[in-house]
């Protein structure tokens, strides 16, 4: 008799159940939402990782989108050959064939047109002849002494293809394009039942005002490092080697109060370029105390330790390191799969289910 519930009590119980259900669903939804922050020094590969997410998780670039990159491909190609020609003057390197000096003059005259998204046969011919020149190649081989796009050789070696009138950039061409990131680029995608929100906050300093809005509730940080920066000569406006600058930034982020509970994933990127460089440029350029061999494995492992040793909370915080080539879709796909598994594992830990 005393156990019967009034209609009012029943409604209250139902309401309570519904609230519990909603809270549980909200909790599960929150656990499925992943906020990823892409950080790292300039030109470390952050934007390339974002492009890869579009290719891997969002069906890639449509033909229409690829067409829109045509002008960027041409601009990157021309800026690269111009950078090499200008460096020849500074490094006092002569053309192998003196006739190339006329081509160089012609290059500066014709360069403007290609920025509009088309390349004349005349300009393509000029660039091709210059790129084949032994003096230009000698200067290209000394690119650590000046600023040159990583994709310079990729485009210049493929000039016949990209100079075709009906040329449409491929996914790989798009991946290789270099456009300075300004502001915050946000990408959304779903993978393994997780809803990812990825923020590339690599914009220039003037754009960094709003960075702080991105710092709360970050699930994981992907910190990109360009391994191949280890031997770059300091530009006049630089205080320290790019690798040391990158380490300084990593130290600050890894040990930052904002990211106490955030997984730190370290992408030691441009491993392909590093593998080539280490055969010619010793690691002691960057780390004078380095006593190991200049093999890819040993040198890469040393750089990994240099970064991981910056972690001041080794007992509570793990750094998840991966060697990457951001322009290699298969490599990024494999690595991101592993990264996602770490995020899932850590999510389960936070929920007390692991």
């Amino acid at each position: 008799m005393g156990c019967t519930l009034s209609a009012e009590d029943k409604a209250a119980v139902e309401r309570s159940k519904m609230i519990d259900r909603n809270l549980r669903e909200d909790g599960e939804k929150a656990a499925r939402e992943v906020k990823l922050l892409l950080l790292g020094a300039g030109e470390s590969g952050k934007s390339t990782i974002v492009k890869q997410m579009k290719i891997i998780h969002e069906a890639g670039y449509s033909e229409e989108e690829c067409k829109q990159y045509k002008a960027v491909v041409y601009s990157n190609t021309i800026q690269s050959i111009i950078a090499i020609i200008r460096a020849m003057g500074r490094l006092k390197i002569d053309f192998g064939d003196s006739a190339r000096a006329d081509d160089a003059r012609q290059l500066f005259v014709l360069a403007g047109a290609a920025e509009e998204g088309f390349m004349t046969a005349e300009l393509a011919g000029v660039i091709k002849r210059l790129w084949k020149d032994s003096g230009v190649q000698a200067c290209f081989n000394r690119s650590r002494e000046y600023q040159l796009n990583d994709s310079a050789a990729y485009y210049l070696n493929d000039l016949d293809r990209i100079a075709q009138p009906n040329y449409i950039p491929t996914q790989q061409d798009v991946l290789r394009t270099r456009v300075k990131t300004t502001g915050i680029v946000e990408t959304h995608f779903t993978f393994k039942d997780l809803h990812f929100k990825m923020f590339d906050v690599g914009g220039q300093r003037s754009e960094r005002k709003k960075w702080i809005h991105c710092f709360e509730g970050v699930t994981a940080i992907i910190f990109c490092v360009a391994l191949s920066d280890y031997d770059l000569v300091l530009a006049e406006d630089e205080e320290m080697n790019r690798m040391h600058e990158s380490m300084k930034l990593f130290d600050s982020i890894c040990n930052n109060k904002w990211f106490t509970d955030t997984s730190i994933i370290l992408f030691l990127n441009k491993k392909d370029l590093f593998e080539e460089k280490i055969k010619k440029s010793p690691l002691t350029i960057c780390y004078p105390e380095y006593a190991g061999s200049n093999t890819y494995e040993e040198a890469a492992a040393y750089i990994q330790c240099q970064f991981e040793d910056l972690n001041k909370r080794k007992d509570t915080k793990e750094i998840y390191t991966h060697f990457t080539c951001a322009t290699d879709t298969k490599n990024v796909q494999f690595v991101f799969d592993a990264v996602t598994d770490v995020i899932i594992k850590n999510n389960l830990k936070d929920c007390g289910l692991f």
Epitope: R205, K209, L249
Partner: nanobody, 118 residues
Framework: EVQLVESGGGLVQPGGSLRLSCAAS????????MNWVRQAPGKGLEWVSS????????DYSDSVKGRFTISRDNAKNTVYLEMSDLKVQDTAIYYC???????????WGQGTQVTVSS
């Protein structure tokens, strides 16, 4: 040595007001974005408000917009947070944060406790 010292926290009733101060030393105060960040019991850090160097532009999280006001006095190397119409949900440790826009230099105070309770 860099120091950020917060003060002004305390116990207040819902609807009440408080003024937090943060005195900075050991760095070029006028070159930094100054922020207030809070941490409620058992929760993560939550950005509250920012005041930028140069233009003095201000920003607020939706949860405090219209109730909190941030200001800075570059001559006194101090940043303030005027809090009115306080709610129970505003209960937290409030941290002062100085940030140079790169995260290379990012400084934090020890925090000041704000408790809103009847």
């Amino acid at each position: 040595e860099v120091q950020l010292v917060e003060s002004g926290g305390g116990l207040v009733q819902p609807g009440g007001s408080l003024r937090l101060s943060c005195a900075a030393s050991g760095f070029t105060f006028s070159s930094y974005y100054m922020n207030w960040v809070r941490q409620a019991p058992g929760k993560g850090l939550e950005w509250v408000s920012s005041i930028y160097n140069g233009d003095g532009d201000t920003d607020y999280s939706d949860s405090v917009k219209g109730r909190f006001t941030i200001s800075r006095d570059n001559a006194k190397n101090t940043v303030y947070l005027e809090m009115s119409d306080l709610k129970v949900q505003d209960t937290a440790i409030y941290y002062c944060n100085a940030y140079d826009g790169t995260l290379l230099r990012d400084y934090w105070g020890q925090g000041t406790q704000v408790t809103v309770s009847s």
